[in-house]
């Protein structure tokens, strides 16, 4: 509450995080021209980057494009990319949605359809949705923790959100233990009214906030956190502003002297964690 | 304008970024010993990296050490490093500037200079410039979206930058289209008075300020972004500061059992989107 | 001090960050069944990654797990994994502080022991101590280079730490060198009182603050940073809740077909560099 | 699924020539070559985008072998010439979205240069 008598002052934090957890992903592989059922295991060094700060990202779906090399070939035929004739593609152009340069060559792509011919990583990204369900749909049962420091330097007071008292097998809960600071993944989304399930497919964005209100007086002292989730992008969103959360990544290698690219298109929750709140003193 | 009657409180934001754009590089490239023009696509994947939050980079140009193995060899022979005799080189010696651990030993570098040997991965970078014009100037004409959710949670107000009447191929405008979140990469470095061909050759690092001043009455309800950018690195910066912005980072892989690697020297632009502004309330 | 007649306002802030150093690291080294001891050089492209912002992360120690392949293999028999008997495995589950998911069956680790077999990257990593002196300790004569710009856009005033008066050949001092802004790494865990060479093993977080107490009136203008170095991580912190700071990442290859990866846990400082203040205007 | 027919295989010489072609059953961006001698791997010989651009070929068979393509008719041949022994092989043809790129070949036509 606001005692206008203190002296208040915005807290200076920190954050750590440290996610656990193991998916199974059954996905179609083809090798040789045929496509059987493949099974991978994925842990965090598969599934997580090394992130700084305030952030950390689970990727929990993917498209691969593999075994892409720099040369020419016949771009993707997305909605209005296909062409008849060579004066439909103009040399040196660069199609915000396409993924390479134009030659000016209309070519064929499969028996049907001819699309433009570009300079680019080849076989192009074929346009094709996220799988459904999610290929790590299991990562909902993965777990973070989150140790938080936080400074009041005017007040020259330190504190962070786990305390000796605290049990490292705890799961958070908002009745019956709020102070844990090991969430499971799949509490924050159901928290914040969201269903992982759905989310996992695109990506999304989920806020965790975590807000000190610090009566720092000796004589009524209370300065512990409060967690709240939210989440960060919009469901609603219009295609044209890309929905969800994905980012694209290469792994790069060299296959009889040809150097080649194994292309991620990775889906995932970022988690922003968000510290906020005050310090006061008399 | 300050209402001195209301409740202010800070923005609690989070920040997502996406960028658009393929470059297309030539540059010389040496094979076999023989040295040929070579061309080749850059995509996201290529100049940009999985970042979080509120910062994002765009490689501009590049420097390539190919092909290192740690071993001994003759250092580069930088102002001041070269050597007559054992005497100048001091076995475990690390100069800051140097790559390597010096042997003690002066060795020939080539047919005219002598520099002392060092354990390193060698042969060691070469102290070259970055390339003149930068290799993917090209990136000018790359987009990036920004989306953007913020919070007053004192106020328990939530909205972002994107609306859903906005039209997704938009392109920022100061007079034109202020309110669009997609911007060209060379109209921000114009609306900061930079010239985007210059500082892609060292990379900087740009600012982009989205400013928040939120009336939340009810009576006179204002709450939209007002973007601005600004230059954050200096560009009159003493040698000795590492003017530009660049960092190293390397692919590493087998070659006959032997372990290698290739050093890229990456100059690039690194954009920084500072949220910060008030909600105020009665 | 607090001028109750002036407007305040909170700095806006960019950093940037430039690690230089060289590290030489001793290990065992096995080889076709025979170990000896490797030497090998450490440059910024190999102990650090290319971060945004306010963090920097320097790898002080790692384990690694080279030649992993996604198969089934018995569990690293860690305290109360060991099994007599198929009973006591599970087939589809997944121990938190296991690498995999569990077949059900119980398998023969080696001569003495047996444990549940599991489907993961083999061999699962071995859960052994960080390596102790720390593989890396000679970092602590890394330097640093912290590039601050701060802006108050209400005052319509922006600065910069290091200002062109500066010498790049300076190193941080409390009394002799108070504004330089090279630290040494050594230096900044001194002034926090801990020990370099002790937190290198498991690693920690190294808080690095920039305080700014800007008084913007023309007539007494003053706005220089201040540096102020404390740990961020609990020293103290029981082993259930993770102490120190490490994180696990890949290097993923293909040997005669057969996909693996190389596993690498990372103990190392992130630092974090914590900018606050405010710029006062009557 | 395309098929694809090769015909032009033989016994010859070595440093003598032999004309490989082979027939598409539809349109196709890229046409190429791949060889596999006994007890080898399947190795990439020559290879063709849309009307003969680009070309691509092994190190090994640079300025012996030519590859060309009839885009109308759906057919790419191989003109072989300067023959060794170690070019003995099944040949086969196959078909693609880029000259790096293949996803169908023929049954393959023997070729056998004798020393």
């Known amino acids: 509450s606001d005692k206008l008598y203190q002296r208040k002052e915005p807290v200076i934090s920190s954050v750590h995080t440290k996610v656990k957890g193991i998916a199974e992903v059954t996905e179609n592989v083809t090798e040789g021209g045929v496509t059987k059922l493949g099974h991978s295991i994925f842990d965090t060094a598969d599934y997580t980057f090394p992130l700084q700060g305030n952030s950390f990202f689970v990727m929990t779906n993917y498209v691969k494009s593999e075994g892409q090399v720099q040369t020419l070939c016949p771009e993707y035929p997305r909605r209005g990319a296909q062409c008849s004739s060579d004066r439909r593609c103009k040399k040196g152009w660069m199609d915000p949605q396409s993924k390479g340069i134009q030659t000016g060559r209309c070519v064929p792509y499969d028996k049907t359809r001819k699309t433009c011919e570009v300079s680019a990583w080849c076989p192009t990204e074929e346009e094709k949705e996220a799988p459904r369900p999610a290929l790590l749909r299991s990562a909902e049962n993965f777990t973070v923790l989150i140790k938080n420091n936080i400074h009041f330097p005017g007040h020259n007071y330190t504190t962070r959100n786990i305390l000796p008292t605290m049990n490292g097998s705890c799961t958070f809960h908002k009745t019956w233990d709020p102070q844990c600071s090991i969430f499971r993944l799949g509490d924050i989304f159901q928290e914040a009214g969201e269903n992982f399930t759905e989310v996992a497919v695109q990506g999304g964005i989920m806020g965790i906030e975590i807000y000190w209100d610090c009566n720092l007086d000796s004589w009524s002292h209370h300065c512990r956190p409060r967690y709240s989730f939210r989440r960060l992008d919009d469901k609603n969103m219009d295609e044209s502003f890309v929905p969800g959360y994905n980012f694209r990544y290469a792994k790069y290698y060299k296959e009889n002297n040809v150097e080649k690219r194994t292309l991620i298109k990775a889906f995932g929750i970022r988690f922003d964690i968000l510290v906020f709140g005050t310090g006061g003193k008399f | 304008s300050d209402k001195l009657y209301q409740r202010k409180e800070p923005v609690i934001s989070s920040v997502h970024t996406k960028v658009k754009g393929i470059a297309e590089v030539t540059e010389n490239v040496t094979e076999g010993g023989v040295t040929k023009l070579g061309h080749s696509i850059f995509d996201t994947a290529d100049y940009t990296f999985p970042l979080q939050g509120n910062s994002f980079f765009v490689m501009t140009n590049y420097v390539k050490s190919e092909g290192q193995v740690q071993t001994l060899c003759p250092e580069y022979p930088r102002r001041g490093a070269q050597c007559s005799s054992d005497r100048r080189c001091k076995k475990g010696w690390m100069d800051p500037q140097s790559k390597g651990i010096q042997t003690g030993r002066c060795v020939p570098y080539d047919k005219t200079r002598k520099t002392c040997e060092v354990s390193a991965w060698c042969p060691t970078e070469e102290e070259k410039e970055a390339p003149r014009p930068a290799l993917l100037r090209s990136a000018e004409n790359f987009t990036v979206l920004i989306k953007n959710n913020i919070h007053f949670p004192g106020h328990n107000y939530t909205t972002r930058n994107i609306l859903p009447t906005m039209n997704g191929s938009c392109t920022f405008h100061k007079t034109w289209d202020p309110q669009c979140s997609i911007f060209r990469l060379g109209d921000i470095f114009q609306e900061a008075g930079e010239n985007f061909t210059e500082v892609a050759v060292q990379g900087g690092i740009m600012g982009i300020e989205i400013y928040w001043d939120c009336n939340l009455d009810s009576w006179s309800h204002h709450c939209r972004p007002r973007y601005s950018f600004r230059r954050l690195d200096d560009k009159n910066m003493d040698e000795s500061f590492v003017p530009g912005y660049n960092f190293r980072y390397a692919k590493y892989y087998k070659e006959n059992n032997v372990e290698k690697r290739t050093l890229i020297k990456a100059f690039g632009i690194r954009f920084d989107i500072l949220v910060f502004g008030t909600g105020g309330k009665f | 001090s607090d001028k109750l007649y002036q407007r305040k306002e909170p700095v806006i802030s960019s950093v940037h960050t430039k690690v230089k150093g060289i590290a030489e690291v001793t290990e065992n080294v096995t080889e076709g069944g025979v170990t000896k001891l490797g030497h090998s050089i450490f440059d910024t492209a190999d102990y650090t990654f290319p971060l945004q912002g306010n963090s920097f992360f320097v790898m002080t120690n790692y384990v690694k797990s080279e030649g992993q392949v996604q198969t089934l293999c018995p569990e690293y028999p860690r305290r109360g994994a060991q099994c007599s008997s198929d009973r006591r495995c599970k087939k589809g589950w997944m121990d938190p502080q296991s690498k995999g998911i569990q077949t059900g069956r119980c398998v023969p680790y080696d001569k003495t022991r047996k444990t549940c077999e599991v489907s993961a990257w083999c061999p699962t990593e071995e859960e052994k101590e960080a390596p102790r002196p720390a593989l890396l300790r000679s970092a602590e004569n890394f330097t640093v280079l912290i590039k601050n710009n701060i802006h108050f856009p209400g005052h319509n005033y922006t600065t910069r730490n290091i200002l062109p008066t500066m010498n790049g050949s300076c190193t941080f001092h409390k009394t002799w060198d108070p504004q330089c802004s090279i630290f040494r790494l050594g230096d900044i865990f001194q002034e926090a009182g801990e020990n370099f060479t002790e937190v290198a093993v498991q690693g920690g977080i190294m808080g690095i603050e920039i305080y700014w107490d800007c008084n913007l009136d023309s007539w007494s203008h003053h706005c220089r940073p201040r540096y102020s170095f404390r740990r961020l991580d609990d020293k103290n912190m029981d082993e259930s809740f993770v102490p120190g700071y490490n994180f696990r990442y890949a290097k993923y290859y293909k040997e005669n077909n057969v996909e693996k990866r190389t596993l690498i846990k990372a103990f190392g400082i992130r630092f974090d560099i914590l900018v606050f203040g405010t710029g006062g205007k009557f | 699924e395309v098929q694809l027919v090769e015909s032009g295989g033989g016994l010859v010489q070595a440093g003598g020539s032999l004309r490989l072609s082979c027939a598409a059953s539809?349109?196709?961006?890229?046409m190429g070559w791949f060889r596999q001698a006994p007890g080898k791997e399947r190795e990439f010989v020559a290879g063709?985008?849309?009307?003969?651009?680009?070309?691509r070929y092994a190190d090994s068979v640079k300025g012996r072998f030519t590859i060309s393509r009839d885009n109308a008719k759906n057919t790419v041949s191989l003109q072989m010439s300067g023959l060794k022994p170690e070019d003995t092989a099944i040949y086969y043809c196959?078909?693609?979205?880029?000259?790096?790129?293949?996803?169908?070949r023929g049954q393959g036509t023997q070729v056998t240069v004798s020393s």
């Open positions: 196959a078909t693609g979205t880029s000259v790096y790129h293949y996803q169908y």
């Open positions: 539809e349109r196709t961006y890229s």
């Open positions: 063709s985008g849309w009307d003969g651009i680009p070309t």
